[in-house]
Interface confidence: medium
């Protein structure tokens, strides 16, 4: 997260760290007791490493009573996701067992109504991604509030040049932005999960390249079918 600040500890109990061989790789969001939603591209970076999900964490390194690392029983990328595109960049991870819920571990309601968030709405994005262009990684969860940007503006030739589909949304990226390591994390508007940080190699914090988020409402049928 660029230009953000440290999150209040455990105030986002849905927040997950998707880890490979014990290292944070991507963000994720607990959407059901046994399921974490993340970005499909995160799996590509996992290679053959052991994928696990950390829940109940604020600090990645310090012991915390609520922290628990779960093995992954099943990884379900969206069937249409492809390595060369950010389309359908969603991944569902089934935990080896139901998460132990509590004040610091709780699923987040996700948007099912397939309607665009009003441009200008401030949405919260959180993650353990880099906090500087030099690549500094935080130990504690960071967050930032970003105004949603309308799709037409986001699709301007000088910005994303038509790449933003109806199944994606954008947020402003002027100094404050999601970045490498935040992919798969939640974009929360009004207490509801609206978007998932896409995992392309987009430049961060540059107004000309707004943040791109996969709209979960557009994938309600797929999410329901996997969770069923």
């Amino acid at each position: 997260i660029l230009g953000g600040r440290e999150a209040e500890a455990h105030a986002r109990p849905y927040m997950a760290s998707v880890q490979v061989n014990g290292e944070h790789l991507c963000g994720g969001v607990l959407v059901a007791e046994q399921w974490v939603l993340s970005a499909a591209h995160c799996l590509e970076d996992a290679a053959d490493g052991k994928v696990q999900v950390l829940l109940g964490a604020h600090s990645l390194s310090q012991p915390e009573p609520s922290k628990r690392l779960y093995d992954v029983l099943r990884a379900v990328p969206h069937p249409d996701s492809r390595p060369d595109t950010i389309d359908h960049d969603l991944l569902l991870l089934q935990l080896s067992e139901k998460a132990t819920l509590g004040p610091a571990v709780r699923p987040l309601p996700w948007q099912r109504v397939d309607r665009d968030v009003e441009p200008g709405t401030l949405c919260d994005v959180a993650g353990w991604g880099i906090v500087s262009h030099a690549g500094r990684r935080p130990d504690r969860l960071q967050h930032v509030l970003l105004p949603v940007l309308d799709r037409a503006t986001c699709n301007r030739r000088t910005h994303h040049d038509g790449a933003i589909t109806q199944r994606m949304m954008c947020a402003e990226s002027n100094r404050r932005d999601s970045c490498k390591g935040d992919s798969g994390g939640p974009l929360v508007c009004g207490g509801v999960l609206e978007g998932v940080v896409t995992s392309g190699s987009r430049v961060c914090g540059n107004r000309k390249k707004p943040g791109i988020y996969t709209r979960v409402a557009s994938y309600a049928a797929w999410i329901d079918s996997v969770l069923a």
Epitope: E118, P119, L122, T153, N174
Partner: antibody, heavy 118, light 107 residues
Framework: EIQLQQTGPELVKPGASVKISCKAS????????ILWVKQSHGKSLEWIGN????????SYNLKFKGKATLTVDKSSSTAYMQLNSLTSEDSAVYYC???????????WGQGTSVTVSS | DIVMTQSHKFMSTSVGDRVSITCKAS??????VAWYQQKPGQSPKLLIY???TRHTGVPDRFTGSGSGTDFTLTINNVQSEDLADYFC?????????FGGGTTLEIK
């Protein structure tokens, strides 16, 4: 020093239009949005809309859509608000303010009084 | 639209006292709330944003608190120059909306 300098008071006839300007100085104009606010009877504040000079992107309060038109001239770091088809209900003080979009207005113009009278 | 309600139109206090001005949002706005002070004949001035962060140059007598739907601006050790109208504003979602204002009177 950050300043937003607005045009002086306007006395206009019903049905006419008025264009208020807001000249920004002391900061990079395209780094911040400009918001416009109406204050009637010296009390309540109403948000009219925002314009983002970088994207040329506007957001309006539906109540003022069609009544107010927001524009900017980046070369002179000036924001404009045109008010159309004026009635006595539009008599008020109008403020422009700077905002970085992540909170309200941090610097305000001195206000422009618009009086609609025949 | 989100309605911001300042239940007290007027509040009376004495120099040196502490006063709390409240604002209630009709729905959850998180901490996306600002407070403004407007002295007679002047433009509004930003005091507090993100519910509790003081704007540059604002005396630490002014404190903001709250989240969700209930917000408070507290002025400690009230000074005569604090005579003004105080407005809350939410910027969580469009349209941005203001409270009706509270006039602080100094006895």
């Amino acid at each position: 020093e950050i300043q937003l300098q607005q045009t002086g008071p306007e006395l206009v006839k019903p049905g006419a239009s008025v264009k208020i300007s807001c000249k920004a100085s002391g900061y990079s104009f395209t780094d911040y949005i400009i918001l416009w606010v109406k204050q009637s009877h010296g009390k309540s504040l109403e948000w009219i809309g925002n314009i983002n000079p970088y994207y040329d992107y506007t957001s309006y309060n539906l109540k003022f859509k069609g009544k107010a038109t927001l524009t900017v001239d980046k070369s002179s770091s000036t924001a404009y608000m045109q008010l159309n088809s004026l009635t006595s209900e539009d008599s008020a003080v109008y403020y422009c303010a700077r905002s970085d979009g992540y909170y309200g207005g941090d610097y305000w113009g001195q206000g422009t009084s618009v009086t609609v009278s025949s | 639209d989100i309605v911001m309600t300042q239940s007290h139109k007027f509040m009376s206090t004495s120099v040196g006292d502490r006063v709390s001005i409240t604002c209630k949002a009709s729905q959850d706005v998180g901490t996306a709330v600002a407070w403004y002070q407007q002295k007679p004949g002047q433009s509004p001035k930003l005091l507090i944003y993100w519910a509790s962060t003081r704007h540059t140059g604002v005396p630490d007598r002014f404190t903001g608190s709250g989240s969700g739907t209930d917000f408070t601006l507290t002025i400690n050790n009230v000074q005569s120059e604090d005579l003004a109208d105080y407005f809350c504003q939410q910027y969580s979602s469009y349209p941005w909306t203001f409270g009706g204002g509270t006039t602080l009177e100094i006895k």
